[in-house]
């Protein structure tokens, strides 16, 4: 009986010779559980596993802890890959995180973190980031040191408020912090002075809600 080839991330898929961007099936480390992800095989050498994407507001990102844990949306469009998979993946290997951003004026920018991982669910999928470079700000818009993940039904932030309810979306809120890529999607000309938009402060400043965002990861030794 022929053994089925499994891939833990898009870098493995790329190295296997499959170099076309698209949806692929990934397998949880040390498990048979599978998840569908979008693999970007074109950006900066390819092999990127997309863990978040926003582009048109077609998917509601004001979701529960369970939904953010397991993932939601469509890998062909807007989606969240899932905290549990990303946590397991990044705890066993050193990964870089690239965040690609687009504004409504036609500009693009990125932030690249040379080491990224999520703690497990017992630590509320706390984010860990080091080594920031890129064009989307010299200061990290994800608060440092990393915060716990919060959702509308699981408040783990450092605010007297409930950031996820106030700003909408699940995110690594501080109190509430300089970013929220899972905020409310606002169309062009309605995207400024927003208290709950898609925010990356150290690129576009306060109240500016972005047009598109992509978070993607790849092994550091790719």
């Amino acid at each position: 009986k022929e053994e089925k080839t499994t891939f833990r991330d898009c870098a493995e898929i790329f190295k296997s010779g499959l170099t076309t961007s698209g949806i692929y099936t990934l397998t949880f480390p040390n498990s048979t559980e599978e998840v569908k992800a979008y693999c970007d095989m074109d950006m900066g050498g390819g092999g990127w596993t997309v863990i978040q994407h926003r582009e048109d507001g077609s998917v509601d990102f004001q979701r529960t802890w369970k939904e953010y844990k397991e993932g939601f949306g469509s890998p062909l469009g807007e989606y969240w890959l899932g905290n549990e998979f990303v946590s397991q993946l990044t705890s066993g290997h050193r990964y870089v995180l690239k965040i690609q951003l687009k504004d409504w004026e036609g500009s693009e920018a990125h932030s690249l973190y040379e080491h990224f991982y999520l703690s497990g669910e017992e630590s509320n999928y706390r984010i860990h980031l080091t080594g920031l470079t890129g064009t989307a700000g010299k200061i990290s818009s994800i608060s440092q040191p990393g915060s716990d993940f919060s959702t509308k039904d699981s408040d783990n932030d450092k605010c007297i408020c409930k950031c996820s309810q106030m700003l909408t979306g699940g995110w690594w809120f501080d109190a509430c912090g300089p970013s929220n890529l899972n905020g409310q999607y606002y169309p062009q000309k309605q995207n400024t002075n927003k208290f709950n938009g898609i925010k990356w402060y150290y690129w576009k400043g306060s109240g500016y809600s972005l047009k598109a965002t992509t978070m993607m990861i790849r092994p550091a030794d790719f």
Partner: nanobody
């Protein structure tokens, strides 16, 4: 739609006074804090004063304490900054900005700059003889 409109800027001699107004629309002051910020040419934007209308709490930067007074009129949805004993170093564009009042870190009294998500266009204050 959230809007903040500043007015009251102008040219004033050293030692003089001005009163800036910040008219808010699209939200009520009861649930928000309003901050006044200023930016001089070639310098970073800095916090000057802030007020939480609901609790009446106020904040002042050390450089303006005793000279500036912040107040609000919730019936007009407007915040004021009374500036007395003005100095040449007070010359800047003055902005007002809003933040939901509850967006506070445990144990803190005021808000970092990045929490203010709604901004006005600014009004120029020039202090010169």
């Amino acid at each position: 739609e959230v809007q903040l409109v500043e007015s009251g800027g102008g040219l004033v001699q050293p030692g003089g006074s001005l009163r800036l107004s910040c008219a808010a629309s699209g939200f009520t002051l009861d649930d928000y804090a309003i901050g006044w910020f200023r930016q001089a040419p070639g310098k970073e934007r800095e916090g000057v004063s802030a007020i939480r209308s609901s609790g009446g709490s106020t904040y002042y930067a050390d450089s303006v304490k005793g000279r500036f007074t912040i107040s609000s009129d919730n019936s007009k949805n407007t915040v004021y900054l009374q500036m007395n004993s003005l100095r040449p170093e007070d010359t800047a564009v003055y902005y007002c900005a809003a933040v939901p009042a509850g967006r506070l870190r445990f144990g803190e009294q005021w808000y970092p700059l990045y929490e203010y998500d709604a901004w006005g266009q600014g009004t120029l204050v020039t202090v010169s003889s």
